[in-house]
Interface confidence: low
């Protein structure tokens, strides 16, 4: 017997559907209507035939009352080939829901997204996460998707993007976006970061995560942030192979005074890199290759320094307390 494709937990909180059959019974997903967290994995299916069964252009207001009654706050959709028209139809309907967090992963979006009709309402998401999503429209995908969202998005995460750079002239500002996560785009690099951080489109960013993005030096990242006018409070550069030295011909970069937390863990560092901000509250240098305790003049003024997982910290060696290195 084949297992049920959908499983709802005992608290009616989380519902996970794995549709792996070639001809799945999509009606099984109805058991998820009472769940707050819903995950739907389509087993790599092409959802093109769906367009024949649903009217993607129908006025979504006819479903408004039904959709408003759904408890879903977090929705994950994964592993499918989705026509852009179908995605837009779903977004139009979900605009009447109480959905706050949407995750799209392992999707191939085909075709172009139609423009937002005048009478349509955008989706009031606080969080949008995309992992391994490809778009037929290339660099303009973010601008196309953005028009279907209300401007209150707070968290945007884009991982394993096929085109991590955006068409900046088409993208509108994200006035409420406080967290941007571009981690797990190893081909991004510092030049790609400059292209992705569209100038003045991310005015409110507080947390910027760039784990495993092909960054080379903190100074190079500093230059990209300065060019874009992005001033995060917290910057995560962990899991990049960082160089400790700076190219002598490269201009010095002044870090924004807003930056108070910097994560340089798992960066393969054999010494504290040059060109760090002069003052930080938090500096994470854990799990690097530091063979000796850093000297005070090698470090920024730092309140909370994490050094665990480095070779010099053999058992019995004392870790300096936060603030004792100032």
């Amino acid at each position: 017997t084949t297992p049920e494709p959908c499983e709802l937990d005992d608290e009616d909180f989380r519902c996970v559907c794995n549709f792996s059959e070639p001809q799945p019974d999509w009606s099984e997903a109805f058991q998820c209507v009472s769940a707050v967290e819903v995950e739907i994995h389509a087993g790599g299916l092409n959802l093109e035939p769906f367009l024949k069964r649903v009217d993607a252009d129908a006025d979504p207001r006819q479903y408004a009352d039904t959709v408003k009654a759904l408890r879903v706050r977090r929705l994950t959709v994964g592993a499918a080939q989705v026509p852009a028209q179908l995605l837009v139809g779903a977004l139009r309907v979900l605009a009447y829901s109480r959905l706050k967090e949407l995750t799209l992963e392992d999707l191939k979006i085909t075709g172009t997204m139609p423009p937002l009709p005048l009478e349509a309402t955008g989706l009031a998401l606080s969080s949008l996460r995309l992992r391994n999503v490809s778009w037929a429209t290339g660099r303009s995908w973010l601008a196309e998707l953005q028009q279907w969202l209300k401007p209150g998005l707070k968290v945007l995460s884009i991982a394993q993007a096929h085109s991590p750079a955006f068409s900046c002239e088409q993208v509108r500002a994200f006035p409420a976006l406080t967290s941007l996560d571009l981690s797990d785009n190893p081909g991004l690099g510092e030049r790609g970061l400059m292209a992705a951080l569209c100038p003045h489109k991310f005015p409110a960013i507080q947390n910027l995560a760039l784990r495993n993005t092909g960054m080379e030096t903190p100074t190079g990242v500093c230059a990209a942030l300065a060019a874009a006018g992005v001033q995060p409070h917290s910057l995560d550069l962990s899991h990049n192979s960082l160089r400790a030295t700076v190219n002598p011909s490269a201009p010095r970069c002044m870090w924004s005074s807003a930056l108070n937390s910097l994560n340089l863990s798992f960066a393969g560092l054999e010494q504290v890199p040059k060109g760090l901000p002069a003052k930080l509250r938090v500096l994470d240098l854990s799990c690097n290759r530091l063979n000796r305790a850093p000297q005070p003049d090698e470090l920024p003024e730092v309140d909370n320094l994490t050094l665990d997982g480095n070779p010099f910290l053999v058992p019995g060696t004392a870790l300096p307390h936060e603030g004792s290195m100032n």
């Epitope: 947390n207 917290s234 937390s261 509250r281 665990d308 870790l319």
Partner: nanobody, 122 residues
Framework: QVQLQESGGGLVQPGGSLRLSCVAS????????MGWYRQTLGDQREMVAT???????RYADAVKGRFTISRDNAKSAVYLQMNSLNREDTAVYYC????????????????WGQGTQVTVSS
């Protein structure tokens, strides 16, 4: 050994206020994220508010505008100021902290307090 000691719970009337405190003690080197979670009988523990070392706070929708989380990094302490309390806020409130500490070697893990009861009733 690291310990989290909560205090400040009690009985309060609807519309009233309480201030919860939690102090981490032991051989602590640094404290990362700290926060408050709550649990009612038979329910899952849910996040109320968290705050990172730099003071960036996150709140559950149900408490936004009523509760304020703060911390004193020097004291390894976190506080939760709860205003305009209502009956739905009745729960056991737990302190949580991500701590780098020294036992046999350096380690970092999440610690939980024993919990403090908050009852909102007239």
């Amino acid at each position: 050994q690291v310990q989290l000691q909560e205090s400040g719970g009690g009985l309060v009337q609807p519309g009233g206020s309480l201030r919860l405190s939690c102090v981490a003690s032991g051989n602590i080197r640094s404290v990362g994220d700290m926060g408050w979670y709550r649990q009612t009988l038979g329910d899952q523990r849910e996040m109320v508010a968290t705050i990172d070392y730099g003071g960036v706070a996150r709140y559950a929708d149900a408490v936004k505008g009523r509760f304020t989380i703060s911390r004193d990094n020097a004291k390894s302490a976190v506080y939760l100021q709860m205003n305009s309390l209502n009956r739905e806020d009745t729960a056991v409130y737990y302190c949580n902290a991500d701590i780098l500490y020294k036992s046999d070697s350096y380690a970092r893990r999440e610690f939980w307090g024993q919990g403090t009861q908050v009852t909102v009733s007239s």
